[in-house]
Amino acid sequence: AILGRSETQECIFYNANWERDRTNRTGVEPCYGDKDKRRHCFATWKNISGSIEIVKQGCWLDDINCYDRTDCIEKKDSPEVYFCCCEGNMCNERFSYFPEMEVTQPTSNPVTPKPP
């Protein structure tokens, strides 16, 4: 780790469209990138009538939106497809939705994904 920062070397991998994209369906993905740039993990999912459907999980390239985030949390209010990113090995294993609202407190619970 650099100055206490957790370097990301591998992430949980999942692809719901694995057949179409000709990839594995699930596993662990080693993260590659330019040696001086930061690497992250990401997760994307949909909420279909209260049921969580993972779209993809994997490695994500240097992105200031993800810096120093140990947890994978989507903060955007009601996106069509939820996306979060984080730093640290396998940090995308769990992901959450906590929309940033003016006054109200977040009401959502962390999601522990179970790929279908």
């Epitope: 993809k56 994997g58 390239l61 200031i64 939106n65 497809v81």
Partner: antibody
């Protein structure tokens, strides 16, 4: 090695639309943003918008809002930029670039708008 | 989303140093370490030189350096060489909750 290969030059009439493609290779397409930038002849760079290919989420510069649509096809690792209601001032070279830092660029696509 | 402000041109002799400034606001240049610098030779695509204010892109000579003070970022090129003659643009990280914006560009002439 990372490569972004764009579609060829286009000539369009005012009022029509153009769709430029950007095929990525040498890295995982769903691991970073694709940005679109244009440069009119003799002018500077102008940011048009960005897409997160994995979620499909887009952001557009205010100037192009309502006229530009950026999409991505993860099965072919290709991003697209469509600009509608073309006018002569849209004559420019259009570039795609990888990631939030724009660390790799396509070769550019010249779009000429002329009656 | 107003364009960042750069000088239209700068010049220097081989071996000298030049500095190009890029002035914005607290929401772009002054916000976090979002500023990048690009070099563009005529008829070519831009090339990333400096990202995150001061980090040199892989393969870029250490003659190129970046810094920031308040809402103004600077690119310094020391030991000027003929091949450094090009247009230089500052710009900001774009993606997620961040919108992109570029400076108007600075033409560097090596005398």
């Amino acid at each position: 090695q990372v490569q972004l290969v764009q579609s060829g030059a286009e000539v369009r009439k005012p009022g029509s639309s153009v769709k430029v493609s950007c095929k990525a290779s040498g890295y995982t397409f769903t691991s970073s943003y694709i940005n679109w930038v244009r440069q009119a002849p003799g002018q500077g760079l102008e940011w048009m918008g960005t897409i997160n290919p994995v979620s499909g989420s887009t952001s557009y510069a205010q100037k192009f809002q309502g006229r530009v649509t950026i999409t991505a096809d993860t099965s072919t690792s290709t991003a697209y930029m469509e600009l509608s209601s073309l006018r002569s001032e849209d004559t420019a070279v259009y570039y795609c670039a990888r990631g939030g830092w724009f660390d790799y660029w396509g070769q550019g696509t010249l779009v000429t708008v002329s009656s | 989303q107003s364009a960042l402000t750069q000088p239209r041109s700068v010049s220097g002799s081989p071996g000298q140093s030049v500095t190009i400034s890029c002035t914005g606001t607290s929401s772009d240049v002054g916000s976090y370490n979002r500023v990048n610098w690009y070099q563009q030779h005529p008829g070519k695509a831009p090339k990333l030189m400096i990202y995150g204010v001061s980090k040199r892109e892989s393969g870029v000579p250490d003659r190129f350096s970046g810094s920031k003070s308040g809402n103004t970022a600077s690119l310094t090129i020391s030991g000027l060489q003929a091949e450094d003659e090009a247009d230089y643009y500052c710009g900001t990280f774009a993606g997620g909750r961040y919108y992109g914006v570029f400076g108007g560009g600075t033409k560097l002439t090596v005398l």
